[in-house]
């Protein structure tokens, strides 16, 4: 990864970035004054417009999500946008601010009872009522009552990484999402070539930890594209 650094004399606490653009490699998107952002009613002038290009939610802050800035816009154009508050429209959990989740297209409070019910409801809606198992695990085994903590421990059900304790991230496991350890040096990681490709994984891995990046293992450079092994390596 590109190592970026915090400057000790840096200007801090300026207005949060309202966006940025992500697209296909080499693509460019204009950052013009007076762009209207979804979820807000104001026009933001270029004076404090700080576009933050993103490929996925994890690159944005806990109070943000990664999405196209315009309704019906180019699907490849993505920026960090402010999360949606309660009763605002949503399409997925990450769009809702911490303490909320997306239910029937609306951000609602994720108090424990509703949260648990919604996870089961989502599983049922997405995969039908078939309660069959995979590798001996029930689709609902990760939903035990012990899994609701203020900051999720390893194995706890989560909606986003901010729900998990330090050193853990929120990643898909079967048909749920649980807190898993952030990857350490030498561990196998997943390099996503396309936005959204991680959505196909039943067992999603966390990202590499601080100071590490997901790169092709040196002795695998000659291997075919499909068999290249990526591991977390020092910059």
């Amino acid at each position: 990864t590109l190592n970026s650094v915090l400057n000790s004399n840096a200007i801090k606490n300026l207005p949060p970035p309202l966006g940025g653009a992500a697209g296909h490699p080499g693509s460019a998107v204009s950052a013009a004054p007076g762009i209207l952002y979804p979820g807000g009613n104001k026009y933001q002038t270029i004076d404090n417009y700080q576009p933050y290009p993103c490929a996925e939610d994890e690159e944005c802050g806990t109070d943000e999500y990664c999405a196209s800035p315009t309704r019906g816009g180019d699907a490849g154009v993505q920026i960090c946008l402010a999360c949606r508050k309660r009763r605002k429209r949503c399409m997925r959990h990450a769009m809702c601010c911490p303490g909320n989740y997306c239910k029937n297209g609306i951000c609602v409070s994720s108090d424990q009872n509703h949260f648990r019910g919604e996870i089961e409801e989502t599983i049922t809606e997405s995969f039908g009522n078939d309660h069959s198992t995979l590798d001996g695990y029930s689709r609902r085994t990760t939903l035990s009552s012990k899994m609701y903590h203020t900051k999720g421990q390893e194995g706890s059900v989560c909606l986003r990484s901010s729900d998990c304790a330090s050193g853990l991230c929120c990643a898909r496991h079967f048909w749920s999402k649980i807190c898993k350890p952030v990857l350490k040096e030498g561990q196998v990681c997943t390099k996503h070539r396309r936005k959204g490709s991680h959505g196909l994984e039943i067992f999603q891995r966390c990202y590499c930890g601080e100071g590490l990046s997901c790169r092709i293992q040196k002795d695998h450079h000659q291997a075919s594209n499909s068999s290249r092994l990526h591991t977390c390596q020092r910059h």
């Epitope: 915090l6 940025g20 697209g23 490929a55």
Partner: nanobody, 124 residues
Framework: EVQLVESGGGLVQPGGSLRLSCAAS????????MGWFRQAPGKEREFVAA????????VYADSVKGRFTISADNSKNTAYLQMNSLKPEDTAVYYC?????????????????WGQGTLVTVSS
Amino acid sequence: EVQLVESGGGLVQPGGSLRLSCAASGRTFSSKTMGWFRQAPGKEREFVAAINWSGGLTVYADSVKGRFTISADNSKNTAYLQMNSLKPEDTAVYYCAAGNGGRAYGYSRARYEWGQGTLVTVSS
């Protein structure tokens, strides 16, 4: 101490070119986003360009689109801003900006942190 150090600024004639570099040094953390901002005398700091290296994703201010190109060299921990067809109104202090890594590092918002800047003067 941690730093973003810009270089490459200077005096150039209208229509000329310059290439700015931003080297990251000191205690580092992983960020996929780098950017450039500028501040002309008596004006607000404004966004110029940003890049998300993971997909070669770029965004530009309208005022520089088609003239400036942002890029990054992962292996050298360096970001670049190639500036062509420079105009007198491009005269400013140019600041390199580093993304804070977002939620992976516990931040509520993805923000930029700035270097000290390098002066670019476009004048005949």
